[in-house]
């Protein structure tokens, strides 16, 4: 059989449908979950609907054999299988292999160091989000792109502040937390900021490892 | 033509093995399934089990869950069917049928197997 | 799991006689059954699926019928090659269930 990836976002409404047109006059059409369990199946000009996780979210459209699915859900990841029974008893199946997706969270940075280094400023910030598989990038005044979680940079003495953007993203969706950093190095923890709310479409966090217990939002 | 070759009579003795082949000659699907089909002396037919050489896919008869388990060797085309833990009961013709999920419109010639002390 | 009851057990007939298989699902199983023959030393071989569809190459005395639960296979004028035992199966779940056989003997 052949098989179609497709990566969807946790609450949206999915199309699993083939590219090219079903047989002609075909005797039946399943649609499966995983191996073998049964989603709907038409036959005799006629759908039916099985119990299953699906039941009331899903409806097959006979013609071209598209099963629409609303409110698609992380358990919903799996392999589809469309069987169909020709007429001359033959079958064809394609599989679509679905992945569900949360829209990633707002990232938190987290101040893991800060220090004065040869009249230098020595800078570690780490950009949090609660356990998924996430893209790291870092925007701002760096030599090169980072694409990890954590940045490391050395401020050459400076009067003005400086910005670090972490974007973290994954197929579906993509979320960014800047982090305004003012001189001196070892400032109070007030004189960093973040990017208001507005500037960002969304609350950003800042946690600094002194004050993992105060969030400071703006 | 496609055909479906098994491999030849077993005899075994009670609490053993048996691993019983079946290979796809002529066949140019590049999807197929294999099912496994027993019958005792004298009895019915009995399915008991389903294999996807493509993606790896098995599901077994409740009944023989535990002791039965099914591989397949895609370089040669050949499914492999095991049975463990052999009683007496297990004397029967076993069968390799496809190439489809729902019907069997192929069958292997059997593969005889005799369980006795 | 899907049981399959076939009857008659046995049925002995004359050439150019009309035989006729019942085979009942004890669930809704729609279309999802194959009819199969079997002779004495080989394997089964397949007639019917989907309930009604003839197998490629099987002759056209041989028919099905049926769907739901209740399903029928007919042997419009019996040949003296038509001996064996006659096996139903249901392809709606697993596991795949087969009824107990229909054995057919010519007078």
């Known amino acids: 059989g052949r098989l179609v990836h497709m990566t969807v976002v946790s609450g949206s409404n999915v199309t699993l449908n083939i590219s090219e047109s079903l047989p002609e006059n075909y005797k039946q059409l399943t649609w499966f979950y995983t191996f073998d369990q049964k989603i709907v199946e038409w036959d005799s000009g006629k759908s039916k609907y099985f119990e299953s996780k699906f039941k009331g979210r899903v409806r097959l459209d006979p013609q071209s054999g598209a099963l629409y699915i609303s409110k698609v859900q992380k358990e919903d990841n799996s392999t589809y299988v469309m069987r169909v029974l020709k007429k001359d008893g033959y079958e064809q199946e394609w599989k679509i292999k679905l992945q569900v997706l949360d829209p990633v969270p707002k990232p938190v940075i987290k101040i893991e160091k800060r220090e004065d280094v040869d009249d230098n400023c020595y800078l570690k910030l780490s950009c949090v989000i609660p356990g998924e598989s996430v893209n790291y990038t870092w925007y701002g005044e760096l030599p090169k792109e980072i694409q990890n979680s954590v940045l490391e940079t050395t401020l050459k003495p400076h009067k003005h502040s400086r910005c670090y953007t972490c974007q973290v993203s994954n197929s579906v969706s993509s979320k960014n937390g800047t982090f305004c950093f003012s001189p001196p190095c070892t400032a109070a923890r007030s004189e960093q900021k973040l990017i208001s709310e507005e500037d960002l479409g969304g609350e950003q966090k800042l946690i600094s490892e002194e004050d993992l217990h105060h969030h400071h939002h703006h | 033509q496609v055909q479906l070759v098994q491999s030849g009579a077993e005899v075994k003795k009670p609490g053993a093995s048996v691993k019983v082949s079946c290979k796809a000659s002529?066949?140019?699907?590049?999807?197929?399934?294999i099912h496994w089909v027993r019958q005792a002396p004298g009895q019915g037919l009995e399915w008991m089990g389903i294999?996807?050489?493509?993606?790896?896919?098995?599901r077994y008869a409740q009944k023989f869950q535990g002791r039965i388990s099914m591989t397949w060797d895609t370089s040669t085309s050949t499914v492999f069917m095991e049975l463990s833990s052999l009683k007496s009961e297990d004397t029967a013709v076993y069968y390799c049928?496809?190439?489809?999920?729902?019907?069997?419109?192929?069958w292997g010639r059997g593969t005889p197997v005799t369980v006795s002390s | 799991d899907i049981q399959m009851t076939q009857s008659p057990s046995s049925v002995s007939a004359s050439v150019g006689d009309r035989v006729t298989i019942t085979c009942r699902a004890s669930?809704?199983?729609?279309?999802?059954l194959a009819w199969y023959q079997q002779k004495p030393g080989k394997a089964p071989n397949l007639l019917i699926f989907?309930?009604?569809s003839l197998q490629s190459g099987v002759p056209s005395r041989f028919s099905g019928s049926g769907s739901g639960t209740d399903f029928t296979l007919t042997i419009s004028s019996l040949q003296p090659e038509d001996f064996g035992t006659y096996y139903c199966?249901?392809?709606?779940?697993?596991?795949?269930?087969f009824g107990q056989g229909t054995k057919v003997e010519i007078n």
């Open positions: 294999t996807n050489p493509n993606d790896g896919n098995t």
């Open positions: 049928a496809g190439l489809r999920y729902w019907f069997f419109d192929l």
């Open positions: 669930q809704d199983i729609s279309s999802w």
């Open positions: 002529g066949h140019t699907f590049t999807n197929y399934y």
């Open positions: 199966q249901q392809t709606d779940n697993f596991p795949r269930t």
């Open positions: 989907a309930a009604s």
